[in-house]
């Protein structure tokens, strides 16, 4: 145990000219890497907006919160944070906005206390299926991660590999069943068109799921049944047209759930009747009085809660011989 007195070393900002002096020696307890700012009392290291191209090797052993935001890391290799001795205390790692386009298998290995990881605002064209699990075993050692923040990680269209982006992300989430303890998952702003049907069933500990600002059209094949701990489900700003009976029943069956559905292009025709009835009765939808129709044109901006069955009709589909030109 230590009994530190206040000293200048507890908060230091290393000068740029020391950048080449990175040592392979084990770091001193109060050493602060070049281009970083350290506070031992807050157990925090901030290497922010410094155009770093790799993770500093000489991170202090006390680091519990590591901010590596606004850099130019490009690739996160296997064992990017592996140190001898290991960074046993590191609990929160923020790599947002650091121009990462590749995260390799085992990038976060040897971080036994890592609870919160933020990779947001990186154009992840290549996210290894084993980025979070560390191995390609069918069942990996459980990851300590509790919060995984992956907002706006979709790469530009021309940088995407010839595979489904949704599939790539989901493969990383499900590999080796390593993320069984995950409680918060944020996947906002990723242009997701669909949610693979098996993803939620394998994340049974989820309490908070954010899928806002995507392009989800339907939840028909998505099951929420296993997510008995789910407390918040953010589906704002998607392309949802209607929620069908199966989805409504599953959401209603979750004991602690709050659902956010604002700014979706709801289609107010005969298929909407069940959802309107449910909305009028349910307490789980936050701000349900703000939900409005987008289509058909005659229903635009009508409030869903104010509709009745007579408002919700489907134009008859005429047989071809009776259709006019």
């Amino acid at each position: 145990s230590s009994s530190p007195t206040s000293s200048a070393s507890s908060f230091s900002s290393s000068a740029p000219f020391l950048a080449s002096a990175v040592s392979a020696q084990p770091p001193l307890p109060d050493q602060c890497p070049a281009l970083c700012e350290c506070s031992e009392a807050a157990r925090t290291v901030k290497c922010v907006n410094r155009n770093l191209t790799e993770v500093p090797t000489d991170l202090p052993a006390y680091v519990r919160n590591l901010f590596l935001t606004g850099n130019q890391l490009a690739v996160l290799p296997a064992g990017a944070f592996a140190r001898r001795p290991p960074l046993a205390e590191l609990a929160a790692l923020n790599l947002s906005g650091s121009r990462l386009d590749e995260v390799r298998a085992g990038a976060f290995e040897h971080l036994p206390s890592l609870r919160q990881l933020d990779l947001s605002h990186n154009p992840l064209a290549d996210l290894s299926p084993f980025a979070f699990s560390g191995s390609n075993a069918s069942v990996s050692a459980p990851s300590p991660l509790v919060e995984l923040i992956l907002n706006h990680i979709v790469p530009p269209e021309d940088e995407r590999q010839n595979r489904s982006f949704e599939g790539m992300v989901v493969a990383a989430l499900l590999a080796g069943r390593a993320l069984q303890g995950l409680r918060r998952l944020e996947l906002a702003s990723n242009h997701f068109l669909y949610l693979p049907r098996d993803v939620l069933a394998q994340l049974p500990s989820l309490r908070h799921l954010d899928l806002s600002n995507n392009s989800l059209v339907s939840l028909t094949y998505v099951s929420f049944r296993n997510l008995t701990h789910l407390e918040s489900l953010h589906l704002e700003d998607n392309a949802l047209k209607v929620l069908h009976n199966g989805t409504l029943a599953e959401l209603q069956g979750l004991p602690h759930i709050r659902v956010f559905l604002d700014n979706n292009p709801w289609v107010c025709d005969c298929h909407m009747a069940d959802m309107v009835t449910w909305l009028k009765e349910t307490e789980v939808v936050q701000g349900k009085d703000r939900l409005t129709c987008a289509y058909p044109e005659k229903m635009r901006n009508r409030v869903l809660l104010e509709l009745n069955s007579a408002d919700l009709d489907c134009d008859p589909i005429l047989p071809p011989s009776l259709q006019t030109s």
Partner: antibody
């Protein structure tokens, strides 16, 4: 919810020792440092030190390093502080406190126990 | 040790007033400054972390500003229940230290 339940008031004689407890619930005990803070009557707050429940590593305020000993029992999610060689100056309310609502972040306290009053008197 | 100096020691206010409490650190602590409210016979309660970050469940009338060594806690429209002692805390360097407090009372 997240709670820290402290042991009851103590009346002790000068020169004696006392061990007070703080039982955590509603979060993973080993995820967050446990801090101890002293508040003498009508006075401000003084940080005594903290302990990492995961490995028992402690950090003390120099002022209290010969006065307080911090320990934990992981099996019962309980933190302890022993105060020794007590004098009237040690009469105060002692709080345990942690940052248990927020992963990772340290150096501030968003969950506090109700406090344990220690009175040193002959 | 970093010394935290709060002013004024006491502030007498009328409900609806906008008030500012000052805290000065004896050396720069970046934004590692936290504010607490303590009502009579209660434990302290975190109001603001990292100089200006709001805390869930704390009324929006409480806000913080500052960086380096000068910090301010503002209450934009004081309510009667805001009476108590307000402490600032250095969360930057060991040992963690608190100011002596500003007592907020009603006129």
């Amino acid at each position: 919810g997240v709670q820290l339940q402290q042991s009851g008031p103590e009346l002790v004689k000068p020169g004696a020792s006392v061990k007070i407890s703080c039982k955590a619930s509603g979060y993973t005990f080993t995820d967050f440092y446990m801090n101890w803070v002293k508040q003498s009557h009508g006075k401000s707050l003084e940080w005594i030190g903290d302990i990492n429940p995961n490995n028992g590593v402690t950090t003390y305020n120099q002022k209290f390093k010969d006065k307080a000993t911090l320990t934990v029992d992981k099996s019962s999610s309980t933190a302890y502080m022993e105060l020794r060689s007590l004098t009237s100056e040690d009469s105060a309310v002692y709080y345990c406190a942690t940052g248990a609502i927020h992963y990772g972040y340290d150096g501030y306290f968003d969950v506090w126990g109700a406090g344990t009053t220690v009175t040193v008197s002959s | 040790d970093i010394v935290m100096t709060q002013s004024p020691a006491t502030l007498s206010v009328t409900p609806g007033d906008r008030v500012s409490l000052s805290c000065r650190a004896s050396q720069s602590i970046s934004d590692y400054l936290h504010w607490y409210q303590q009502k009579s016979h209660e434990s302290p309660r975190l109001l603001i972390k990292y100089a200006s970050q709001s805390i869930s469940g704390i009324p929006s009338r409480f806000s913080g500003s500052g960086s380096g060594s000068d910090f301010t806690l503002s209450i934009n429209s004081v309510e009667p229940e805001d009476v108590g002692v307000y402490y600032c805390q250095n969360g930057h360097s060991f040992p963690l230290t608190f100011g002596a407090g500003t007592k907020l009372e009603l006129k």
